[in-house]
């Protein structure tokens, strides 16, 4: 039986959710007037890059779209992007697709996502509404790297 990705709405401690704006992900306040993305999450079967201390290796996609989160270096800086890719195509690959992989770690009731390609770089939202979801190596006051994964029916 083929595995299915788990579905979540994603929210931070300031009640910001992830929203698709064109082909970019931005953070916006939880509000009736905006439609948050449903995040698809599925574990990677290949253990080549695994590191249990950092968490489980997962692929992240946008439900209802052939879009997956992807890390690439732009002008020398690790950058978070969306790439046209079906999450199940990544899952069925025998070899781990490193740029699409994230370490998913639980910190209390929150989730943290660290790039496998760029260790020490985490998915983050800024404190300002409407800004893109990005990668940061600075966890703390100005960036939020802890997220709540809310079950959606």
């Amino acid at each position: 039986r083929e595995a299915a990705p788990k579905s979540y709405a994603i929210r931070d401690s300031r009640q910001m959710v992830w929203v698709l704006s064109g082909n970019s992900l931005i953070a916006a306040p939880l509000s009736r007037s905006i439609k948050p993305v449903t995040l698809h999450l599925i574990a990677c079967r290949d253990t080549e890059f695994s590191d249990k201390e950092k968490g489980n290796m997962v692929y992240l996609g946008i439900k209802g779209k052939d879009l997956c989160l992807f890390c690439a270096e732009i002008q020398g800086k690790p950058t978070l992007q969306l790439k046209e890719k079906n999450i199940m195509d990544l899952y069925v690959e025998k070899k781990a697709q490193k740029p699409f992989l994230f370490f998913h770690n639980k910190e209390g009731s929150t989730s943290v996502f660290q790039s496998v390609s760029y260790p020490g770089w985490f998915i983050a939202t800024s404190t300002t509404s409407g800004q893109p979801i990005f990668l940061t190596k600075e966890r703390g006051i100005t960036n939020n790297t802890n997220f709540y994964l809310d079950s959606v029916e």
């Epitope: 709405a9 929210r11 009640q15 916006a28 007037s33 009731s109 404190t127």
Partner: antibody, heavy 122, light 111 residues
């Protein structure tokens, strides 16, 4: 249908700790995406949010009360509780518990308890 | 002092239209968090009247409507009735406080 009922002592002495419980019926306190809050209303005044706890166990407190407030959940009794320490006469109020759901009421409170009056006096 | 500002009182004659304003800031209403409105009849708990800026829960008459623009929101009541006499509160979320905020309340008197 979700219902909330506050309970606890109606009289608390100054400098002591106020303790209230909200019993949830018609649904589970651990149900996904719900948040549970405490709001108070001093006599003749407006509403003040004290703090909240959600289904993940995450707590959020009013910065002006944070040093004195603890909110917790007892899943076995389907209840959540408020503790407010070092009370003074200024804490005399009707205390309400209320709830909402993240992706349905969008940070509003759609179900409220009937409220309980707590008087701080020696 | 409340984070959201409302007029202390408004009044109107039966059948008239009244509006109640609610002014916030760039960290709450202006940051695009929703505004909710509550009606509190004398001696009772608040009741959700409008949620998500302009949506009525089932059972709330369509005489009540909400709107939002910039850092402000307003509640309108048309065809004023004696039973509308109550206190009305706006509420939103404030990211700088990481918490829920209320207006100071507005007492509506039906003349």
């Amino acid at each position: 249908e979700l219902q909330l009922q506050e309970s606890g002592p109606g009289l608390v002495k100054p400098s002591e700790t106020l303790s209230l419980t909200c019993t949830v019926s018609g649904g589970s306190i651990t149900a996904s995406n719900y948040y549970w809050g405490w709001i108070r209303q001093p006599p003749g005044k407006g509403l003040e949010w004290i703090g909240s706890i959600d289904y993940t166990g995450s707590t959020y407190y009013n910065p002006s009360l944070k040093s004195r407030v603890t909110i917790s959940v007892d899943t076995s009794k389907n209840q959540f509780s408020l503790k407010l320490s070092s009370v003074t006469a200024a804490d005399t109020a009707v205390y309400y518990c209320a709830t909402g759901k993240y992706y349905e009421t969008y940070l509003g409170f759609d179900v409220w308890g009937q409220g309980t009056l707590v008087t701080v006096s020696s | 002092e409340s984070v959201l500002t409302q007029p202390p009182s408004v009044s109107g004659a039966p059948g008239q239209r009244v509006t109640i304003s609610c002014t916030g800031s760039s960290s709450n209403i202006g940051a695009h968090y929703d505004v909710h409105w509550y009606q509190q009849l004398p001696g009772t708990a608040p009741k959700l009247l409008i949620y998500g800026n302009d949506n009525r829960p089932s059972g709330v008459p369509d005489r009540f409507s909400g709107s939002k623009s910039g850092t402000s929101a307003s509640l309108a009541i048309t065809g004023l009735q004696a039973e509308d006499e109550a206190d009305y509160y706006c509420q939103s979320y404030d990211y700088s406080l990481s918490g829920y905020v209320f207006g100071g309340g507005t007492k509506l008197t039906v003349l």
